[in-house]
Interface confidence: medium
């Protein structure tokens, strides 16, 4: 807390400029007037302020709005977002993307800190879903962030947001996240032809159950070890030796390189020897 | 990697100028404040001034407000500090660096190569 | 302006000793302070920030402690490749201003 001295004569900062720099955080605390500092907030940017001097101008801030930050405000917080602590953010009332863009560009190039997290669920809890534009803009800086939330949360996601979600943005998520995201994507998708289809439903198959497989077993897709290594255990084991060699065309070969490994181990000790001897490979069940 | 490069030398007759350069790679130039430090022999180092490649904001330390001025050119990645009415308390090694990450931090982490600059008659 | 005062220019020290470079800023600085290590003819090189915080890739027995205004760098087990040019800094107020440095030296 930095305690109330007058401002020296002639030290009164009639705008925010980078003259303030050369304050010390008393002379900031005492010559700068805190509704001045909130319409210039978009100025502190070009300043290079220290982080003791932006301890002082948040200090300001929080004085002038003890019940949280005007949007108008928030939106150009640039820098000094990254001093807001989560309970700060809490009291925010977060609504335009434009807002969360802003804030998002500050942190970019760091991990998820508990600050962008706090905003992101003030934002996406104040548009009651995860609409395709907020998860576009959230994936494209964070392209874990799909993952990062619980099936719960994934179920508030309309299928027409799926159609920002990139194969990257998957990469880290569990079963029963795919489970949550794989239907919306399938109802997303519908209306797309068979190979069109795949190309876009293809890392969304950790969620597919066995009927869904044996459906695109006939449909010449030609599926990659990578993506069938990722299906569910329980939804491969039911697929014949046919319906396998069929889903993976050429790259059933690789079905060797992976035999110890689930889900593939699981289903060659489920099929008989005759049919895996079918293949070739030299499979052992 | 990210790299500031500067001339080595430069040899320059006392009350002249010299623009010193300091070229930026490996990263965004625009995104990063950009400082200059200088340091005579045997000595320790002086903050000059602080400069913004994007916005083209500047800041001084008093000492150098009438014989420094930053600029840069954004579609050469280039920083430059012009030194004017050279003498020989001007004799030392300047240097261009930068802190890599968060605002507010400001201490170095790269800095440029060093040129020295030697004013002499 | 801060200053920062080394009040050692050399010191000695003989391989494998255990060191301390001192810094006192001549107002409190918190933890705002950096320091760095110089060979001849280059440039400085960061070896902690936030007066304790190691930079990536700095060896183990560079350590850093201190706040307000009293600041140490520790150099345990020293190294015959440590015997160089050690500078403080100060980023709690500008103009942001280092030590005059501390030459390590043999014994």
């Known amino acids: 807390e930095v305690e109330k001295t007058a401002c020296p004569s002639g030290k009164k900062a009639p705008e925010i400029d980078e003259s303030l720099i050369f304050y010390k955080k008393w002379e900031l605390e005492a010559c700068v007037d805190a509704a001045l500092l909130a319409t210039q907030m978009d100025r502190v940017n070009a300043i290079p302020f220290t982080y003791e001097q932006l301890d002082v101008l948040k200090h300001k801030l929080d004085e002038l709005y003890p019940q949280g930050y005007p949007e108008s405000v928030i939106q150009h917080l640039g820098y000094l977002f990254l001093k807001m602590s989560p309970e700060d953010i809490r009291k925010w009332n977060v609504t335009s993307l434009e807002t969360l863009k802003a804030l998002l560009e500050v942190n970019k190039g760091h991990e998820m800190s508990p600050q962008v997290a706090t905003l992101i669920d003030r934002f996406v809890k104040g548009r009651g879903q995860l609409d395709k534009d907020t998860l576009d803009t959230l994936t494209a800086f964070y392209p874990g962030y799909l993952c990062s939330l619980s099936p719960e949360e994934l179920s508030s996601v309309p299928p027409s947001s799926i159609w920002a979600v990139r194969p990257q943005d998957l990469d880290t998520c569990d079963p029963r996240q795919l489970d949550v995201l794989y239907p919306k994507a399938r109802l997303a998708f519908q209306n797309m032809n068979g190979s069109e289809y795949f190309v876009k439903i293809q890392s969304f198959l950790g969620g597919a159950p066995t009927e869904d497989l044996k459906a695109l077993s006939q449909q010449n897709v030609s599926m990659d070890l990578a993506t069938f290594m990722k299906l569910r255990t329980d939804a491969v084991l039911p697929l014949t030796v046919a319906e396998v060699q069929k889903l993976l065309g050429p790259h059933v070969e690789g079905l060797k390189a992976e035999e110890r490994h689930r889900p593939v181990r699981d289903w060659i000790l489920r099929q008989r020897q005759d049919d895996l001897d079918t293949l070739g490979l030299g499979l052992q069940g | 990697q990210v790299q500031l490069q500067q001339p080595g030398a430069e040899l320059i007759k006392p009350g002249a100028s010299v623009k010193l350069s300091c070229k930026a790679s490996?990263?965004?130039?625009?995104?990063?404040?950009m400082h200059w430090v200088k340091q005579r022999p045997g000595q320790g180092l002086e903050w000059i001034g602080i400069?913004?490649?994007?916005?083209?904001?500047?800041n001084y330390n008093e000492r150098f407000k009438s014989k420094a001025t930053l600029t840069v050119d954004k579609s050469s990645s280039t920083a430059y500090m012009q030194l004017s009415s050279l003498t020989s308390e001007d004799s030392a090694v300047y240097y261009c660096?930068?802190?890599?990450?968060?605002?507010?931090?400001?201490?170095?982490?790269?800095w440029g190569t060093g040129t020295t600059v030697t004013v002499s008659s | 302006d801060i200053v920062m005062t080394q009040s050692h220019r050399f010191m000695s020290t003989s391989v494998g000793d255990r060191v301390s470079i001192t810094c006192k800023a001549s107002?409190?600085?918190?933890?705002?302070v950096a320091w760095y290590q110089q060979k001849p003819g280059q440039s400085p090189k960061l070896l902690i920030y936030?007066?304790?915080t190691q930079h990536t890739g700095v060896p183990d027995r560079f350590t850093g402690s201190g706040s307000g205004t009293d600041f140490t760098l520790t150099i345990n087990n020293v190294q015959s490749e440590d015997l160089l040019d050690y500078f403080c800094?100060?980023?709690?107020?500008?103009?942001?201003?280092f030590g005059a440095g501390t030459k390590l030296e043999l014994k």
């Open positions: 660096a930068r802190r890599s990450s968060n605002y507010g931090d400001w201490y170095f982490d790269v």
């Open positions: 490996g990263y965004t130039f625009t995104s990063y404040w």
């Open positions: 400069i913004h490649p994007n916005i083209g904001s500047t």
């Open positions: 107002q409190d600085v918190g933890t705002s």
């Open positions: 936030w007066a304790s």
């Open positions: 800094q100060q980023y709690s107020s500008y103009p942001l201003t």
